[in-house]
């Protein structure tokens, strides 16, 4: 029998790697069975996920999973790092693995660089 | 039922550059995460990389200077670019998807191969 | 990076009997980390099991996987016709990505 437990698929060891000044939307594969709870986002400062108030944030439902989403619009150098989705089920906290946005801003550099180019060159990233 | 379907040449020439383009039919290229694996014959399986659907990618450090993957979330595509290739390169290329209900790397639909030798 | 490294190469069996996969890890995982797959000849492999014991969609249940740390285990309860294939193993624990240099069962 299926679990009707919610679960949240943000992949282990995920990043995203993206410019600073363009719209990015981070997902959280959210998996549920009747009733959509409720979720939020958190950015790590540490071992302290802090809560991400009054952002933009939209659901999207797709054939299995539903995916709520975070809104960038522009990413700023400073959301650069780290991010959880929790969603509140039957009282209890879920928390998704932590996904990272490295972000780099196109005006410090003549030109974009790869996305994957990016993630291995940190120094190109904002802390 | 999602289906993947591997194209492009069939023999590439030593040091030239081999591209394969993977078509997603039966389902969207969006919210998911599609990976290249290539497989010589008669041996084992070898990850490539893997490119989300907003184009974020991650790739095997053995062939990182040579490859790129990239998507085309409007034709339902994505692609594999290896530059510089010897005959240790001949090989099956799989597309494949990794699975989206999961917090790990695992591929749940895989194209049926393409073989690519790379003779001159 | 992570090898897998399975045995035997070769797995000669009869339909009917009990086939038992191995797959070594060269550092230790968590079993959530740890993935099989069959490959028929001229096919794209299938994913048979996840999580180290957890099938697939669709895969029957005299497959079975087991194991934790560094040795996992694949067993096929009673071999069928269909069941004679290649089968890897592959871990996500670290990047990259790697997966086993596969077991043949083929038909004693």
């Known amino acids: 029998k299926e679990s009707c437990d919610v679960q949240l698929y943000i992949k282990r060891q995920s990043y995203h790697s993206i410019f600073a000044g363009d719209p990015f939307k981070l997902e959280c594969p959210v998996k549920y069975c009747a009733h959509r709870p409720q979720v939020t986002w958190c950015k790590l400062n540490g071992t302290t996920c802090v809560k991400l108030e009054g952002r933009h944030t939209s659901w999207k439902q797709e054939k299995n999973l539903s995916f709520f989403i975070l809104h960038f619009e522009p990413v700023l150098p400073s959301d650069n790092g780290s991010y959880r989705c929790s969603a509140n089920f039957l009282s209890a906290i879920i928390e998704s693995h932590s996904t990272t946005l490295y972000v780099t801003d196109v005006k410090s550099a003549s030109e974009r660089p790869s996305k994957d180019e990016m993630a291995s060159r940190p120094w190109l990233l904002y802390s | 039922q999602v289906q993947l379907q591997e194209s492009g040449p069939g023999l590439v020439k030593p040091s030239e550059t081999l591209s394969l383009t993977c078509t997603v039919s039966?389902?969207?290229?969006?919210?998911?995460?599609w990976s290249w694996i290539r497989q010589p014959p008669g041996t084992g399986l070898e990850w490539i990389g893997y490119i989300y659907y907003s184009g974020s990618t991650k790739y095997n450090p053995s062939l990182k200077r040579r490859v790129t993957i990239s998507v085309d979330t409007s034709k339902n595509q994505f692609s594999l670019k290896l530059s510089s290739v010897t005959a240790a390169d001949t090989a099956v290329y799989y597309c494949?998807?990794?699975?989206?209900?999961?917090?790990?790397?695992?591929?749940?639909?895989w194209g049926q191969g393409t073989l690519v030798t790379v003779s001159s | 990076e992570i090898v897998m490294t399975q045995s035997p190469a070769t797995l000669s069996l009869s339909p009917g009997e009990r086939a038992t996969l191995s797959c070594r890890a060269s550092?230790?995982?968590?079993?959530?980390?740890l993935f099989w797959y069959q490959q028929k000849p001229g096919q794209a492999p299938r994913l048979l099991i996840y999580?180290?014991?957890t099938r697939a969609t669709g895969i029957p249940a005299r497959f079975s996987g087991s194991g934790s740390g560094t040795d996992f285990t694949l067993t096929i309860s009673s071999l069928q016709p269909e069941d004679f294939a290649v089968y890897y193993c592959?871990?996500?624990?670290?990047?990259?990505?790697?997966f086993g240099g596969g077991t043949k069962v083929e038909i004693k």
């Open positions: 550092q230790s995982i968590s079993n959530n980390y």
């Open positions: 592959q871990q996500d624990y670290n990047f990259p990505l790697t």
């Open positions: 494949a998807r990794i699975r989206g209900d999961s917090y790990g790397w695992d591929f749940d639909y």
């Open positions: 999580g180290a014991s």
């Open positions: 039966g389902g969207s290229i969006s919210y998911y995460y």
